[in-house]
Interface confidence: medium
């Protein structure tokens, strides 16, 4: 069937439309287009004869139409008047006629809209605002946007006038937003520029900050006032009802008790004409005296003396507080407070009790701190340490030994070689040493204040050749899967290579084996029973190489899950039951048996002669290793048939 399709159906003014013909019959003589829904010679637009390919304009031809051989009609520069129906009249070669009608609609291109408002400065909770989208356009749809979102549902929002007018009733400050309107028709959509609604509000009740109302004499009073308001509020301050100044901040330096009173902030909005006030009551307290600490012993001796610290001055009905190292007092049997907390006593002082100590006096407003006090605890000397730790030196080098002992006041040092006093210095230096410098080197540390003295003796051997090394261990009986063991090759010597062997082989690569301290220390992490091997260390320098005697690691393990033998579980009445329990364990475990949950004997072997069906049941072997603290067990069912 002959049909007409309009492309597009909705046409913008000034654009073009194609009336496209479908299912055109064959053997045609020609065809004509007409404006309207019927064939009317007065409204013919154009005719076309196929044989001559001749197009003939009709009375309704505007010069904007083009006809194509396939009968389609193109209309250019569309005007509003072009809206409507178009009829195609087809004349076939047999002079039989056929007709088809199509249509399209013409719409104007919309201009960019704008928003007009009936109130540019509405007052909150009082005014309404009506926004109107301009211009008014026929056949246009109107839409509204708030902050680029579609209109929220609200009883205070109302659309009217074909959605062209948006009314906000009883505006609030939250209506301060970006408003846009949009016009749409079938051929265009345009959005207006934003209009920001400027809602006048406030002032709200002002807030005075800071919130604290108690001050100390001598401080500065700095109050700030703020009230939500549009336009911003104008502020005034009143003290005890008397006007002070028209500023947002009130500043009074170096206040006294006389500055106590009621402080009022008034906020005024000149546009809304509203005023709001807030009152705060300020109390100024007199300055209490700054506390200080007195001590009954300025130089106490460690582990001998007690010290009593007292917080001065004594004030009636006052709370005294104490701090040590900027922390509240720790719980300790060596710390005692008097009933009024004014005196803190340290019993048997230690070097860790130096402090600093602070006391505080609490008043209505705050806590006043004393200056910190540090105790001068006399201690030591501890056993001196001689460094470096080498015991072997090669001839020709310089020997430089340093001695240090923890002590207050610092220790005085003396050096002795083979019992003979050398010098009173902390360091001993001997250049170009020989074998004759081998001997016992003693460092003596003396504390003149406590009168105590301590010594450390170090054997030094001067030899190019190293001695036979030995292995020291930090754990002689490590527990499997729990402990680590550190072997150290002794002695420590300069310019020495340290080597290790396990069972006569060089060290295997293992994440559980770690060398440190210049290879002098071998650490086994998370030992296993397989680590129970012979460990040998070697030392090597330019002229010697020696190995230690082997040290066998005794790894404690188990007990593993025990095994009961023989494996049989069925016996004949009258037979002897002889069960043996074994569990891998180091040291050997303790064994015990239970039959049907009842404890029996503490032996590895359970023997019952001439068993009967009464001996049916569960036989449990329990193993425990006292060294590892671990236990294990296994249960076996025994059946005795008559």
């Amino acid at each position: 069937k002959l049909t007409i399709e309009s492309t597009p159906f909705n046409v913008a003014e000034g654009k073009e439309v194609l009336l496209l013909v479908h299912n055109l019959p064959q053997h045609l003589f020609g065809y004509s287009w007409y404006k309207g829904e019927r064939v009317d010679g007065n409204r013919q637009i154009i005719g076309y004869v196929i044989g001559t390919q001749q197009a003939t304009p009709g009375p309704a031809y505007s010069g904007r139409e083009i006809i194509y051989p396939n009968a389609s009609l193109l209309i250019q520069n569309i005007i509003q008047n072009d809206t409507g129906f178009y009829t195609l009249h087809v004349i076939k070669s047999d002079l039989v006629n056929e007709e088809a009608t199509g249509q399209f609609r013409v719409y104007p291109e919309l201009p960019k809209p704008s928003i007009s408002s009936n109130n540019s400065k509405p007052v909150e909770d009082k005014d309404a605002v009506a926004f109107t989208c301009e211009p008014e356009t026929q056949d246009a749809t109107y839409l509204w946007w708030v902050n680029n979102q579609s209109l929220p549902v609200s009883p205070r929002l109302q659309l009217s006038n074909g959605n062209r007018t948006l009314t906000l009733f009883n505006v609030t400050r939250n209506d301060t937003a970006s408003y846009k309107c949009e016009t749409q028709n079938p051929v265009s959509a345009r959005r207006s520029d934003s209009v920001i609604l400027n809602v006048l509000y406030g002032p709200d009740a002002p807030t005075i900050s800071p919130l604290n109302t108690s001050y100390r004499s001598g401080e500065n009073l700095n109050l700030s006032c703020h009230a939500a308001s549009n336009p911003p509020a104008q502020y005034s301050w009143f003290v005890n009802g008397t006007f002070q100044q028209s500023t947002q901040e009130l500043f009074i330096p170096n206040i006294t008790v006389n500055n106590s009173g009621s402080y009022t902030c008034q906020a005024h909005n000149s546009d809304t004409g509203l005023n709001r006030t807030t009152v705060t009551t300020i109390t100024v307290y007199a300055e209490p005296p700054k506390p200080f600490i007195t001590s009954n012993n300025s130089n106490p001796v460690e582990d001998e003396d007690a010290v009593a610290l007292t917080c001065e001055p004594e004030i009636q009905n006052t709370t005294y507080l104490w701090w040590v190292n900027n922390q509240s007092l720790p719980v300790s049997p060596r710390l005692q407070l008097s009933n009024d907390n004014r005196t803190l006593t340290l019993l048997s002082v230690t070097r860790n009790d130096v402090g600093p100590y602070e006391c505080g006096i609490q008043n209505e407003l705050s806590v006043d701190h004393s200056d910190p006090v540090i105790l001068n605890v006399l201690y030591g000397p501890d056993d001196p340490t001689i460094s470096p730790s080498y015991t072997y030196y090669r001839p020709g080098v310089n020997l430089s030994l340093s001695c240090h002992a923890a002590s207050n006041p610092p220790a005085q040092y003396s050096w002795l070689i083979d019992g003979n006093i050398q010098q009173h210095t902390q360091e001993l230096f001997i250049s170009n040493i020989t074998e004759k410098n081998s001997g016992l080197y003693t460092c003596q540390a003396n504390n003149s204040a406590s009168g105590h003295s301590r010594t450390t003796v170090k054997t030094i051997t001067v030899s190019a050749e190293l001695p036979k090394p030995s292995i020291s261990s930090n754990n002689s009986k490590p527990v499997e899967d729990k402990d680590a063991v550190a072997f150290t090759c002794e002695p420590e010597a300069q310019n020495t290579t340290y080597l290790w062997w396990v069972n006569g082989q060089s060290l295997p690569v293992s994440p559980r084996l770690q060398l440190s301290n210049g290879n002098r220390t071998l650490t086994l992490f998370n030992v296993t029973r397989n680590d129970a091997r012979a460990y040998v260390c070697g030392i090597q320098n330019s002229v010697s190489a020696n190995r230690s005697d082997p040290v066998t690691l005794d790894v404690l393990y188990g007990p593993d899950t025990p095994i009961i033998s023989p494996p049989d579980s069925s016996y004949l009445s009258g037979a002897n039951l002889n069960l043996s329990c074994h569990s891998a364990s180091n040291p050997s475990p303790q064994y015990s048996w239970r039959i049907n949950g009842i404890p029996q004997q503490h032996t590895q072997v359970l023997f019952i002669a001439k068993i009967t069906p009464n001996n049916n049941g569960t036989y449990a072997c329990f193993v425990s290793n006292l060294a590892t603290g671990r236990n294990n067990s296994i249960v076996k069912s025994i059946t005795v048939s008559a």
Epitope: P395, E435, S463, P467, V536, G538, Q540, V543, N546
Partner: antibody
Framework: QVQLQQSGAELVKSGGSVKLSCTAS????????MHWVRQGPEQGLEWIGH????????EYAPKFQGKATFTTDTSSNTAYLQLSSLTSEDTAVYYC?????????????WGQGTTVTVSS | ENVLTQSPAIVSASPGEKVTITCSAS?????MHWFQQKPGTSPKLVIY???NLASGVPARFSGSGSGTSYSLTISRMEAEDAATYYC?????????FGAGTKLELK
């Protein structure tokens, strides 16, 4: 296995100098020290000194200070002994010697010796 | 330097006989080492660090001593033991050898 291969015999004129080599196989010379020892005809052993091939540190017996110079070439695993201002007193067999603990034993390795003859 | 004096200079022993060679140091040393040398060959370590048997050395060899006095003992002489034996100290520089003791088979 470990071996120390020394260079061949040398006949040197009095006042001249000579450079002897000792090439190690089976171990890296940087991991040990190389000592040099000499033995005069029908005489005992004399320690000349040693070198640490890793850093070139040397130690000489006072008698050989200025007479002997030790060097190494770690890329070829070779130690060298240079002798200068030679006299008939320096006629001897020169040995290189390396000692190291391996496993539970201490091994002491010697080269086969290089005979140096100083002629007038 | 530390001078090592070996004695005797020459010793003859029959197979199965016990042989002792001594080495005296002019200054105390921490250990002594002993070498064996046969004609036309390089020295070979037999005892290290006073009393330790070097690899491949028969158990009939032993060493002892301390301070300035050390000795090497062969419990039962065998023909293959005929050689010159040197002591060596490594406690101080320069390292020194003894003049040697020639052990002959009787």
């Amino acid at each position: 296995q470990v071996q120390l291969q020394q260079s061949g015999a040398e006949l040197v004129k009095s006042g001249g100098s000579v450079k002897l080599s000792c090439t190690a196989s089976g171990f890296n010379i940087k991991d040990s020290y190389m000592h040099w020892v000499r033995q005069g005809p029908e005489q005992g052993l004399e320690w000349i000194g040693h070198i640490d091939p890793e850093n070139g540190d040397t130690e000489y017996a006072p008698k050989f200070q200025g007479k002997a110079t030790f060097t190494t070439d770690t890329s070829s695993n070779t130690a060298y002994l240079q002798l200068s201002s030679l006299t008939s007193e320096d006629t001897a067999v020169y040995y290189c010697n390396e000692g190291t603990p391996t496993g539970p034993y201490y091994f002491d390795y010697w080269g086969q010796g290089t005979t140096v003859t100083v002629s007038s | 330097e530390n001078v090592l004096t070996q004695s005797p200079a020459i010793v003859s022993a029959s197979p199965g006989e016990k042989v002792t060679i001594t080495c005296s140091a002019s200054s105390s040393v921490s250990a002594m080492h002993w070498f064996q040398q046969k004609p036309g060959t390089s020295p070979k370590l037999v005892i290290y660090s006073t009393s330790n048997l070097a690899s491949g050395v028969p158990a009939r060899f032993s060493g002892s001593g301390s301070g300035t006095s050390y000795s090497l003992t062969i419990s039962r002489m065998e023909a293959e033991d005929a050689a010159t034996y040197y002591c060596q100290q490594r406690s101080s520089y320069p390292l020194t050898f003894g003049a040697g003791t020639k052990l002959e088979l009787k």
